[in-house]
């Protein structure tokens, strides 16, 4: 038969013949010949290959460096890389999660719209009229102004986006 010019999906062409690629989790030791199949070897501890391949070296698992605020979210296998995430209170700086930064706090006058996760930062929003935030926080939402009326009190000092209203007693009518 004529030598092939193309091979099947999990094969590669070498020396005018199609050889089987190595399966995920294994690296290439030697190409196939007319008399032997492709020889592959499992990746070592802390190594992986995640595709059918002809690599002669496995990739090292990612190291989740605690000095960068990282921890292991999912341990790597011979077929998958380690997945890192950030310590509590921190989030990844990129999709690859190579380092972490502290969650942002929302300044007074702003409240938390969305609490941060391991991969996304805090989202803040300005407190609208009728709401306030007097603290810098990564968790607190804007609080509604106190309703003086429901306490049979009157507004003595108007609220702002950073302060609550101040309620006081109603002026008594004198006889």
């Amino acid at each position: 038969p004529e030598p092939p010019t193309a091979c099947r999906e999990k094969q590669y062409l070498i020396n005018s013949q199609c050889c089987s690629l190595c399966q995920p989790g294994q690296k290439l030791v030697s190409d196939c010949t007319e008399f032997t199949e492709t020889e592959c070897l499992p990746c070592g501890e802390s190594e992986f290959l995640d595709t059918w391949n002809r690599e002669t070296h496995c990739h090292q698992h990612k190291y989740c460096d605690p000095n960068l605020g990282l921890r292991v979210q999912q341990k790597g296998t011979s077929e998958t890389d380690t997945i890192c995430t950030c310590e509590e209170g921190w989030h990844c700086t990129s999709e690859a999660c190579e380092s972490c930064v502290l969650h942002r706090s929302c300044s007074p006058g702003f409240g938390v719209k969305q609490i941060a996760t391991g991969v996304s930062d805090t989202i803040c929003e300005p407190c609208p009229v009728g709401f306030f935030s007097n603290v810098s926080s990564a968790f607190e939402k804007c609080h509604p102004w106190t309703s003086c009326e429901t306490k049979d009190l009157v507004v003595q000092q108007a609220g702002t986006n950073k302060t609550d209203v101040v309620c006081g007693p109603q002026d008594r009518l004198r006889a």
């Epitope: 099947r8 999906e9 089987s20 399966q23 199949e37």
Partner: antibody, heavy 122, light 108 residues
Framework: EVQLVESGGGLVQPGGSLRLSCAAS????????MNWVRQAPGKGLEWVSI????????YYADSVKGRFTISRDNSKNTLYLQMNSLRGEDTAVYYC???????????????WGQGTLVTVSS | DIQMTQSPSSLSASVGDRVTITCRAS??????LNWYQQKPGKAPKLLIY???SLQSGVPSRFSGSGSGTDFTLTISSLQPEDFATYYC??????????FGQGTRLEIK
């Protein structure tokens, strides 16, 4: 004449183990990959595992990975399937099938054994 | 993994009829498609490999065609011994090796 003869089937309880054998003759056994294919009662064909001819590289269907082990003894012209942690859904006729190539990248199965029935039930 | 879908799942025909069974792959498999015949209580038997090549000893009334994703098995003139279940199988992206769900050919 190519012949494949399976043996080792039978009734086993869930969680139990069984070892199937396939005795081959009529061809150069080590030159070809070998497969196990199963067929549940009244159902279609399901490929289970493959082992390459010389080196003995293996690959498994997800449904049996970690529970079944395929192996071969080229000096005895025999293929094996060690089945552990058996479940009800493993009940089937198990066929050994000869590949037309040496490696595990799969090709037509030109010869099949007659099959051996494995029943997993308490 | 590549999925193989056969149609119809069952078919009634008479001796002498021309019958066509189709097989569709979920992605292109070039011409790496095989057909098997299985009779009740028996092992499958290879009929056609590489989409259109007739396996040695198989009668010439069986033929296969197609490439890419769509394939057909044709029996030009049904004989009594052809009533069986037919399976397609891809061998392009393997392992895993995947079969169609089968087409049962019955006597009308």
């Amino acid at each position: 004449e190519v012949q494949l003869v399976e043996s080792g089937g039978g009734l086993v309880q869930p969680g139990g183990s069984l070892r199937l054998s396939c005795a081959a003759s009529g061809f150069t056994f080590s030159s070809y990959a070998m497969n196990w294919v199963r067929q549940a009662p009244g159902k279609g064909l399901e490929w289970v595992s493959i082992i390459s001819g010389t080196i003995g590289k293996t690959y498994y269907a997800d449904s049996v990975k970690g529970r079944f082990t395929i192996s071969r003894d080229n000096s005895k012209n025999t293929l094996y399937l060690q089945m552990n942690s058996l479940r009800g859904e493993d009940t089937a006729v198990y066929y050994c099938a000869k590949d037309t190539e040496r490696d595990i990248t799969g090709s037509p199965f030109d010869y099949w054994g007659q099959g051996t029935l494995v029943t997993v039930s308490s | 993994d590549i999925q193989m879908t056969q149609s119809p799942s069952s078919l009634s025909a008479s001796v002498g009829d021309r019958v066509t069974i189709t097989c569709r792959a979920s992605q292109s498999i070039s011409s790496y498609l095989n057909w098997y015949q299985q009779k009740p209580g028996k092992a499958p038997k290879l009929l056609i490999y590489a989409a259109s090549s007739l396996q040695s000893g198989v009668p010439s009334r069986f033929s296969g065609s197609g490439s890419g994703t769509d394939f057909t098995l044709t029996i030009s003139s049904l004989q009594p011994e052809d009533f069986a279940t037919y399976y397609c199988q891809q061998s392009y992206s393997t392992p895993p090796i995947t079969f169609g769900q089968g087409t049962r050919l019955e006597i009308k």
